[in-house]
Interface confidence: medium
């Protein structure tokens, strides 16, 4: 598994370097998670043909994964820092149950899946410190999450592979949008 941000050899070798700003830490954290997702996607695509699945089949999914929309204020047109930050944090909190689902889905990248999950928790903490309006952030209901997790694990192999592929693809897109938006803040 890759070394978490702040623990790489460059940090150790350069103790007098300026500490990372809050924004730099967040940026680095997201890029670290994206690297992890790439590794997981590689295993998924090697194992099954889901990565070549037609857009039509993917569009049919009923997973309700978090997605950026115009109203969320994260795009350049209509950008709204506060609304966008709330959307990013809320989205990441909603992704947590899906990241939990991924934990049993990898054989050779088991550590990588765990690293993505734990790094996302850290990213949420970073972002919550940055947010002024924490009241606007809705936390997913644990009971709903538990039953969703049970339902996902109760699928057959084909559906589980498709679900894994969709989660990784959607999470990657969500993080990429978040990264672009956070760089404007």
């Amino acid at each position: 598994a890759p070394v978490p941000p702040g623990e790489d050899s460059k940090d150790v070798a350069a103790p007098h370097r300026q500490p990372l700003t809050s924004s730099e830490r967040i940026d680095k954290q997201i890029r670290y998670i994206l690297d992890g997702i790439s590794a997981l996607r590689k295993e998924t695509c090697n194992k099954s043909n889901m990565c070549e699945s037609s857009k039509e089949a993917l569009a049919e999914n009923n997973l309700n994964l978090p997605k950026m929309a115009e109203k969320d204020g994260c795009f350049q047109s209509g950008f709204n820092e506060e609304t966008c930050l709330v959307k990013i944090i809320t989205g990441l909190l909603e992704f947590e149950v899906y990241l939990e689902y991924l934990q049993n889905r990898f054989e050779s990248s088991e550590e990588q899946a765990r690293a993505v999950q734990m790094s996302t928790k850290v990213l949420i903490q970073f972002l919550q410190k940055k947010a002024k309006n924490l009241d606007a952030i809705t936390t997913p209901d644990p009971t709903t999450n538990a039953s969703l997790l049970t339902k996902l694990q109760a699928q057959n192999q084909w559906l589980q592979d498709m679900t894994t592929h969709l989660i990784l693809r959607s999470f990657k897109e969500f993080l990429q949008s978040s990264l672009r938006a956070l760089r404007q803040m």
Epitope: E60, N61, N104, A154, Q155, N156, Q157, W158, L159
Partner: antibody
């Protein structure tokens, strides 16, 4: 060729436990889930659960959650099912079946079945 | 749990004629454009044998006389023309979600 060889018939007393085996050959054991199915004489088929031999991950039909325990031994390419607290309701033929997964899941190869007779 | 209701419970068909068995699911067994419905044939003293998977695809070595159709909640298995060796029990099975369930079975006999 692919074969699933199940252990012989079991005669057990009420309250006892039995452990049956399903030895796989002709394919890579860890690459496919293994299912277990129950069939009572002259009746339909009931899915008990599956095990992923590669990870040991199991999913059970809630009905059999406290009755059956699925395990797998990678070194001998053998799947096992233990049935506990036996009653006359457990008298049945039990099949193991490989879940062949290419693009959809199918139970393509089945064992010959293990007959369990619970009687005092 | 998804309940599968097969009909008829028993059926007698003359050699060379068509046999049609229906299977209705209590909820849709479709997902991502695939119908997760399989059909099995079982003869006395033998394990079930896969005939049709994903509603309409023939299993390996299954004669073209066996065909499957349907989507959502309604499915059917057709055998035409009926042959001597087709007398058996037939089961539908959904594998969309745990617990995987089977229909009650249809006993097909020669008239």
């Amino acid at each position: 060729q692919v074969q699933l060889q199940q252990s012989g018939a079991e005669l057990a007393k009420p309250g006892a436990s039995v452990k049956m085996s399903c030895k796989a050959s002709g394919y890579t054991f860890t690459s496919y889930w293994m299912h277990w199915i129950k069939q009572r004489p002259g009746q339909g088929l009931e899915w008990i659960g599956y095990i992923n031999p590669s990870t040991g991950y199991t999913e059970y039909n809630q009905k059999f959650k406290d009755k059956a325990t699925l395990t797998a031994d990678k070194s001998s390419s053998t799947a096992y099912m233990q049935l506990s607290s036996l009653t006359s309701e457990d008298s049945a033929v039990y099949y193991c079946a490989r879940d062949y997964y290419d693009y959809e899941d199918v139970m393509d190869y089945w064992g010959q079945g293990t007959s369990v007779n619970v009687s005092s | 749990d998804i309940v599968l209701t097969q009909s008829p419970a028993s059926l007698a068909v003359s050699l060379g004629q068509r046999a049609t068995i229906s299977c209705r699911a209590s909820e849709s067994v479709d997902g991502f454009g695939i119908s997760f419905m399989n059909w099995f044939q079982q003869k006395p003293g033998q394990p079930p044998k896969l005939l049709i998977y994903a509603a309409s695809n023939q299993g390996s070595g299954v004669p073209a006389r066996f065909s499957g159709s349907g989507s959502g909640t309604d499915f059917s298995l057709n055998i035409h023309p009926m042959e001597e060796g087709d007398a058996a029990m037939y089961f539908c099975q959904q594998i969309k979600e745990v617990p995987w369930t089977f229909g009650g079975g249809t006993k097909l006999e020669i008239k």
